[in-house]
């Protein structure tokens, strides 16, 4: 029988590159078995992550995965940076990885790239 | 149900590039972690990299200098270009989703055999 | 890169008969609080097949002859009985950091 403990699926050294200006949801893949866990977001700044309290979140249950989401809409320059959620569950507080927002700034490229350009482009 | 099904050449020669296509049907590479394997002629099998639900892709460091991972999602393929390949490349490769809840490949293709031979 | 290392290589099992699969990890499996460790079975000529996820749950549809155990380093694929069906390759795969890795591969044959 599978474990009921909270657990926080965000990808460890996860990355997605973004434009500003489009919309974006950060999923926060959560486990959980009866009761759905009180869980938040927040923005590294330095060692200390800062709760985003005025941002629009919502929950998305998806073929028996359940999803904490952090809207942007739209994605904005400053929305630069790593990512943690947190559950609390049983007085336990679980934090995820960080994950990173790499926002591009639309008014400084000179082409705007399609999204799957975007998602595609390589560094080697 | 999810099916993935891998296409591309059989035969490449030396210092070529080796495109594959992983064509998905019954979800969305919009959502979840989208991956190629290989598995070479000893049962070896490699990692060879994702790409994600908003695109952004992760290479096996081993790989990073001649891989490359895109994706058409208005076709729902996902795309492997391996460039310089030499006769190490010759492998069995495979795609396969990652489950959210902790990576595993609960679905793959059925893989395509690739020689790399003048 | 975390290394995981399979014993035995191969094994011959009588029908009936129990088959232990060892896998052991360079580093500890369990930066997300839970051990992303899995186990696949490939037949000749066909992809693997996810057998057990997350060390000990079993894949839907997989037989209850299979079972997963272990943590932190070191990890064991049961299979008991055996049936003739089973004779394949079974492989390890680590998901808790990148590049994922798997083990060597684990070849049971039927006694």
């Known amino acids: 029988k599978e474990s009921c403990d909270v657990q926080l699926y965000i990808k460890r050294q996860s990355e997605h590159s973004i434009l500003a200006g489009d919309p974006f949801e950060l999923e926060c893949p959560v486990k959980y078995c009866a009761n759905r866990p009180h869980v938040t977001w927040c923005k590294l700044n330095g060692t200390t992550c800062v709760k985003l309290e005025d941002r629009q979140t919502s929950w998305k249950e998806e073929k028996n995965i359940s999803f904490f989401i952090l809207h942007f809409e739209p994605v904005l320059p400053n929305d630069n940076g790593s990512y943690r959620c947190s559950a609390n569950f049983q007085s336990n507080l679980i934090e995820s990885h960080s994950t990173t927002l790499r926002v591009t700034d639309v008014k400084s490229a000179s082409e705007r790239p399609s999204k799957d350009e975007m998602a595609s482009r390589f560094w080697a | 149900e999810v099916q993935l099904q891998e296409s591309g050449p059989s035969l490449v020669k030396p210092s070529q590039t080796l495109s594959l296509t992983c064509s998905v049907t019954g979800d969305s590479i919009t959502s979840a972690y989208w991956n190629w394997i290989r598995k070479f002629p000893g049962n070896k099998l490699e990692y060879m990299g994702y790409i994600s639900y908003s695109g952004s892709t992760y290479f096996n460091p081993s790989l990073k200098s001649r891989i490359s991972i895109t994706r058409n999602t208005s076709k729902n393929q996902y795309y492997l270009q391996l460039n310089s390949v030499t006769t190490e490349d010759t492998a069995t490769y495979y795609c396969a989703r990652s489950h959210y809840y902790g990576y595993y490949f609960d679905y793959w293709g059925h893989g395509t055999t690739l020689t790399v031979s003048s | 890169d975390i290394v995981l290392t399979q014993s035995p290589a191969s094994l011959a099992v009588s029908l009936g008969q129990r088959a232990t699969i060892s896998c052991r990890a360079s580093?500890?499996?369990?930066?997300?609080?839970?051990?992303?460790m899995h186990w696949y079975q490939q037949k000749a000529g066909q992809p693997p097949k996810l057998l057990i996820y997350?060390?000990?749950n079993l894949e839907s549809g997989i037989p209850a002859r299979f079972s997963g155990s272990g943590s932190r380093t070191d990890f064991t694929l049961t299979i008991n009985p055996v049936e003739a069906d089973d004779v394949a390759t079974y492989y390890c795969q680590q998901t808790d950091e990148d590049p994922y890795t798997f083990g060597g591969g684990t070849k049971l044959e039927i006694k």
């Open positions: 580093e500890t499996i369990d930066s997300y609080g839970d051990s992303l």
């Open positions: 997350r060390a000990s």
